[in-house]
């Protein structure tokens, strides 16, 4: 590229610093916070995105019943430790030496402990249930149109292989999107369902991670689909380990 083309950006991650100093003048981008190089042709891992976010200046039944082992991210934001591939480290600790184990989407799956806490492996989240409520519309969306549109969205915007979108359920005004991806199914280069779900969640909240002018503009047969509530449930390959005290609180 010529010097005139010195403005390069990362379409899939606005929380980056980029410059055309890669091989052949190709655009190279590094994530804020970690300084790790990211591949801008695909999604950035949730761990690196959370790290970048924490470093930024502060400012009837077709519906699925979440399993008893389903986790919801109640702890919110924290500054995570990521491994060299950008994945969450199994054990996370805060500045006061309080530690806990997380799953592959960074959600706590054990009680909090001290520095002696052991997290032997990063447990994979293999099933994600995204539960949405859309704003009132003149009539219900056509289920097959909605299904096709959401599958298209996850393929084209979030780069998620269609086989990982297991199902789309709809009972007006509730929409549920099921993502499934076992360790054995995920090939090199495949987007992780946890990363796709995180990008979708940020899009729905109007906090798009994508570069560009606007956020997500989702339409079904030309009719805008506006979401007013989102809940995400995470199911791990191994059930979480919480004490009975937490379960009865």
């Amino acid at each position: 590229h010529t010097a005139a083309q010195d403005n390069c950006t990362c379409p899939t991650n606005k929380m980056t610093v980029c410059s055309p100093d890669g091989p052949g003048g190709r655009c190279q981008c590094r994530a804020l916070g970690s300084g790790m190089a990211v591949d801008c042709s695909t999604l950035t891992s949730k761990c690196l995105l959370l790290k970048a976010r924490m470093s930024a200046p502060k400012n009837a039944r077709t519906l699925v019943r979440p399993s008893e082992h389903a986790l919801v991210d109640n702890d919110g934001l924290y500054d995570p430790d990521c491994d060299p591939e950008g994945r969450f480290k199994a054990r996370q600790c805060n500045q006061t030496s309080v530690c806990w184990c997380v799953n592959s989407v960074g959600v706590r799956r054990t009680d909090k402990g001290d520095l002696s806490l052991r997290c032997d492996e990063l447990v994979r989240t293999h099933h994600i249930l995204i539960d949405l409520r859309h704003r009132p519309t003149a009539g219900a969306f056509n289920h097959s149109d909605l299904d096709a549109e959401l599958r298209r969205l996850f393929r084209e915007r979030y780069r998620l292989h269609p086989k990982f979108v297991a199902a789309v359920h709809y009972e007006q005004p509730t929409i549920q999107i099921e993502l499934r991806q076992n360790t054995s199914q995920k090939a090199a280069g495949d987007v992780d369902i946890g990363d796709a779900a995180y990008y979708f969640e940020r899009d729905i909240k109007g906090e798009s991670l994508f570069q560009g002018r606007g956020g997500l503009d989702l339409r079904v047969r030309g009719e805008p689909l506006q979401v007013e509530r989102t809940l995400i449930y995470y199911l791990d390959e191994i059930p979480p380990k919480f004490s009975m005290k937490r379960l009865t609180a």
Epitope: H1, A4, Q5, D6, N7, C8, T9, C10, P11, T12, P20, G25, R26, C27, C40, S41, R152, R155, E156, R157, R159, F210, Q211, G212, R213, G214, D217, R219
Partner: nanobody, 126 residues
Framework: QVQLVESGGGLVQPGGSLRLSCAAS????????IGWIRQAPGKEREGVSC????????NYADSVKGRFTISRDNAKNTVYLQMNSLKPEDTGVYYC???????????????????WGQGTQVTVSS
């Protein structure tokens, strides 16, 4: 500021060919999928074709399949649309635009593009 500049439009007879070019200035197209969108007189903008950031995936609207070919040269920061066997209904303003969508299996809709050129007029008439 992202600037996309189209060229290559003009007046051509039915059955003829044109090659449109889309060049980016002060901006590298690396990682962006690029598409061509056209607007016929009195009609809404319609996605014609797109090419993925790597160039490995291309998609076309049914109305132009087999006649139009999209390609890109990332070293030259340029995308091309080769239009053959042109018909009067291909007349319109052709825009090039960049999108964060992948172009892996679909042509993005007009509202899914982020950065637009000013357009170049294509007229197919005898």
């Amino acid at each position: 500021q992202v600037q996309l500049v189209e060229s290559g439009g003009g007046l051509v007879q039915p059955g003829g060919s044109l090659r449109l070019s889309c060049a980016a200035s002060r901006f590298t197209l690396d990682y962006y999928a690029i598409g061509w969108i056209r607007q016929a007189p009195g009609k809404e903008r319609e996605g014609v074709s797109c090419i993925s950031s790597s160039g490995g995936s291309t998609n076309y609207a049914d109305s132009v399949k087999g006649r139009f070919t999209i390609s890109r040269d990332n070293a030259k920061n340029t995308v091309y649309l080769q239009m053959n066997s042109l018909k009067p209904e291909d007349t319109g303003v052709y825009y090039c635009a960049a999108t964060t969508y992948a172009c892996s299996g679909y042509v993005p809709r007009a509202y899914e593009y982020d950065y637009w050129g000013q357009g170049t007029q294509v007229t197919v008439s005898s």
